[in-house]
Interface confidence: medium
Amino acid sequence: DASGDLLNTEAHSAPAQRWSMQVPAEVNAEAGDAAVLPCTFTHPHRHYDGPLTAIWRSGEPYAGPQVFRCTAAPGSELCQTALSLHGRFRLLGNPRRNDLSLRVERLALADSGRYFCRVEFTGDAHDRYESRHGVRLRVTAAAPRIVNISVLPGPAHAFRALCTAEGEPPPALAWSGPAPGNSSAALQGQGHGYQVTAELPALTRDGRYTCTAANSLGRAEASVYLFRFHGAP
């Protein structure tokens, strides 16, 4: 396998470009956001237009698990995705332009770590190269943010309230309202990645209902008001 050293595998009258890969040492992003992992390369095969495969792996070079792989047919600029872990990885660069940059969507803290890009030429010029040092992705935690709060019609002419918040670690949600004693009950939310949703199933009284989201980095709150029209007695 390619060792990561610079190899000149062809002899030309003019000096050929050697294999090399350029990646930044580190990319920083916040949980829930997207990040770009840049990677470009040079190679000694002038005007190579044969089949190629672009690969990204995590953890360690040459042996770590693949998180993304795509293949371009001979003479084609289109790199068809064969693997995108959890559907969150997308090729941003153009391998035919010697660019393997990768976009990672919906980042989680667990995505932190090293990523390694690799290109394989599988045509006449049978060759491959992989970044040895990789790019370190640092995913930082995110304080809670309430992204949606709403009142919806419920069964039997009642109303229900929904609150969706995001953060990393996922925040705990609690509703409080104008019920007697103004007690606050934490509800089990439905989680999707870094987003959490909690429902207050029955709004029995008019007034202000507040959703509070909290994690180790902070808290956020938002309110909705329920005022039903009461006809004349």
Epitope: S20, Q22, P24, V27, V36, P38, T40, T42, H47, D49, A73, G75, S76, E77, L78, L92, G93, N94, R96, R97, N98, D99, S101
Partner: antibody, heavy 116, light 109 residues
């Protein structure tokens, strides 16, 4: 929001030099490839040059090869085009553009006039 | 180098469908992008990678790429769509980007 602002255009004599700049903001400049595209008065668009995110890979149109040099300073979020040995046919509005899925964001352009 | 050929002009009545073609060798193996340019303004990307619409671009804009021809389709054309339109692709052999000559879209009436 993404913003690209070109500067450095002006009137220059044939054989002269000019350096264009493109100040980028609103995105992680150091993660994106960038391009220069030009448009002669009343004519269509012509691609001029490309630079990869780190500056390690550069490509040029045949019409400017050997005369123009593209570069970038990621610490300043700025793209450059050094233009030497200018000719009358280089007269155009020069745009910088971000490269992703085509050229997804463009500056407003800076006019370069080469005339004696 | 690849050459992209567009009709110099296309006319369409308001509310009708406008189609702008872009022909060139081996286009199905290349991504084609489309730009709209109004007088005195910078170009705006309206379709990328053959048939994808950037956010903010109305749904009436669509693209296709088959055979040796890529097509930009504007359904229910509006007066504000009157502009110059350019197709563009990347030539992997010369490592250069190529634009079509441009098409002036006129919305009649």
């Amino acid at each position: 929001q993404v913003q690209l602002v070109e500067s450095g255009g002006g009137l220059v004599q044939p054989g002269g030099s000019l350096r264009l700049s493109c100040a980028a903001s609103g995105f992680t400049f150091s993660s994106y490839a960038m391009h220069w595209v030009r448009q002669a008065p009343g004519k269509g668009l012509e691609w001029v040059s490309y630079i990869s995110y780190s500056g390690s890979n550069t490509y040029y149109a045949d019409s400017v090869k050997g005369r123009f040099t593209i570069s970038r300073d990621n610490s300043k979020n700025t793209l450059y085009l050094q233009m030497n040995s200018l000719r009358a046919e280089d007269t155009a509005v020069y745009y910088c553009a971000r490269g992703w899925g085509g050229f997804d964001y463009w500056g407003q352009g800076t006019l370069v006039t080469v005339s004696s | 180098d690849i050459e992209l050929t567009q009709p110099p002009s296309v006319s369409v009545a308001p509310g009708q469908t406008a189609r702008i073609s872009c022909s060139g060798d081996n286009l199905p193996n290349r991504y084609v992008h489309w730009y709209q340019q109004k007088p005195g303004q910078a170009p705006v990307l309206v379709i990328y990678d053959d048939n994808n619409r950037p956010s903010g671009i109305p749904e009436r804009f669509s693209g296709s790429n088959s055979g040796n021809t890529a097509t930009l389709t504007i359904s229910g054309t509006q007066a504000e769509d009157e502009a110059d339109y350019y197709c563009q692709t990347y030539d992997m052999f010369s490592m250069s980007d190529v634009f079509g000559g441009g098409t002036k879209l006129t919305v009649l009436g």
